[in-house]
């Protein structure tokens, strides 16, 4: 595991960003039924898997970081639903560093989802190679339980 | 090396209440769905609850409904599950368990034994 | 709730004997978005907590010797050991993993003679 002594300027960033986009949450201005809601994450499951087998096969021996916390899923709604505007930010930024045809694939999905007036925050990917290397990767794998734990809670009956 | 060590087991009276707790370590706790599954000696698995990686959303069983609340610290790599108005058929080993990417229970700990009895 | 059914419930096989055993669902636990289905076959050895073999049906968990196959598709499963070695011995059990409440089967006890 990579483990870090004292905090770095990356760690405070990421605490900030995460800090306001929790801060930012607007109201939504149209709710997509469940249905549809549906049909993007069927949408969103084999382009994220292929992404992240891709990348861990590409990659081998880079480790998940513990640094990294995507906020997924919005905490305000039931069944839970992806939380499009904490997400986006993180894929665009890693679009340069990775697939960028499967990236737009799934950039296209994630504004369907998207609520109007959402604000974006930009996110910077750390300039160390192999911290970029497990940023990237910790996103992949932390997006696609996200679209786990919604699969199995839209399959589910209500809890 | 990922570990889960389950602890705060043991004999408890009908009704009354008992905390277990899950240490993990050895992987990123917060990315990660966390499970409670038990097992009665000799018996089939029963899946209990599951939290999702952020803490925000809970799933649990009918038979443990509102009376069992599964809760995380990520700061603190724990797993908890508060249990109260235990009955007598609570009695069995429980386990956590960490969520596989896609499908299936990937990592489980050695289990905690909660007995209720009189 | 999806009700998760094995067969046979123990069998008793020599060192080397080919063994399948079957767990059928009471609904589809295929994910037509990224064709896996949400099914693992957990190992439980005496006095051991459970162990990942398979999942998504037919994915061997790492570490695990390639003996055991999973297969099958939508409702119907087979785990299949293509030369049983005595540590096998074991319960084996599976599990919807595709909703909740996730449910496991009754167990198939694997005896050694």
């Known amino acids: 595991m990579l483990s870090h002594t004292g905090p770095s300027r990356f760690a405070l960033f990421l605490l900030c960003s995460m800090e306001t986009l929790l801060s930012s949450h607007m109201a939504p201005t149209h709710q997509l039924p469940p249905s549809d809601v549906r049909k993007i994450i069927l949408e969103l499951q084999p382009l994220s898997r292929g992404l992240l087998e891709d990348y861990q096969k590409k990659e081998t021996g880079v480790p998940e970081s513990n640094r990294t916390l995507l906020l997924c899923l919005t905490s305000d709604s039931q069944p839970p639903r992806l939380n499009s505007s904490a997400i986006l930010p993180y894929f665009r930024a890693i679009r340069p560093l990775s697939d960028k045809n499967i990236i737009d694939k799934i950039i296209e999905q994630l504004d369907k989802l998207k609520f109007q007036h959402e604000p974006e925050t930009e996110i910077s990917v750390p300039a160390d190679t192999f911290e970029c290397k497990s940023f990237i990767l910790t996103i992949l794998q932390q997006f696609s339980a996200c679209l786990e734990s919604v699969f199995k809670s839209l399959n589910s009956g209500p809890q | 090396e990922v570990k889960l060590v389950e602890s705060g087991g043991g004999l408890v009276k009908p009704g009354g209440s008992l905390k277990l707790s899950c240490a993990a370590s050895?992987?990123?706790?917060?990315?990660?769905?966390m499970s409670w599954v038990r097992q009665i000696p000799e018996k089939r698995l029963e899946w209990v609850a599951t939290?999702?990686?952020?803490?925000?959303?809970?799933y649990s069983a009918d038979s443990v409904k509102g009376r069992f609340t599964i809760s995380r610290d990520n700061a603190r790599n724990t797993l908890y599950l508060q249990m109260s108005s235990l009955r007598s058929e609570d009695t069995a080993v429980y386990y956590c368990?960490?969520?596989?990417?896609?499908?299936?229970?990937?990592?489980w700990g050695q289990g905690t034994l909660v007995t209720v009895s009189a | 709730d999806i009700v998760m059914s094995q067969s046979p419930s123990s069998l008793s096989v020599s060192a080397g004997d080919k063994v399948t055993m079957s767990c059928k669902s009471s609904?589809?636990?295929?994910?037509?978005?990224?064709?896996?289905?949400?099914l693992a076959w957990y190992q439980q050895k005496p006095w051991q907590p459970p162990k990942l073999l398979i999942y998504?049906?037919?994915t061997r968990e790492s570490g695990v010797p390639d003996r055991f196959t999973g297969s099958g598709s939508g409702t119907d499963f087979t785990l299949t050991i293509s030369s049983v070695q005595a540590e096998d011995l074991a319960v084996y059990y599976c599990?919807?993993?595709?909703?909740?409440?996730?449910?496991f089967g009754g167990g198939t006890k694997l005896e050694i003679k």
């Open positions: 599990q919807n993993d595709y909703s909740y409440p996730y449910t």
């Open positions: 939290i999702t990686s952020g803490g925000g959303y809970t």
């Open positions: 998504g049906a037919s």
């Open positions: 609904q589809s636990l295929l994910n037509s978005g990224n064709q896996k289905n949400y």
């Open positions: 050895g992987f990123a706790f917060s990315s990660y769905d």
């Open positions: 368990a960490r969520q596989n990417w896609v499908v299936g229970l990937a990592y």
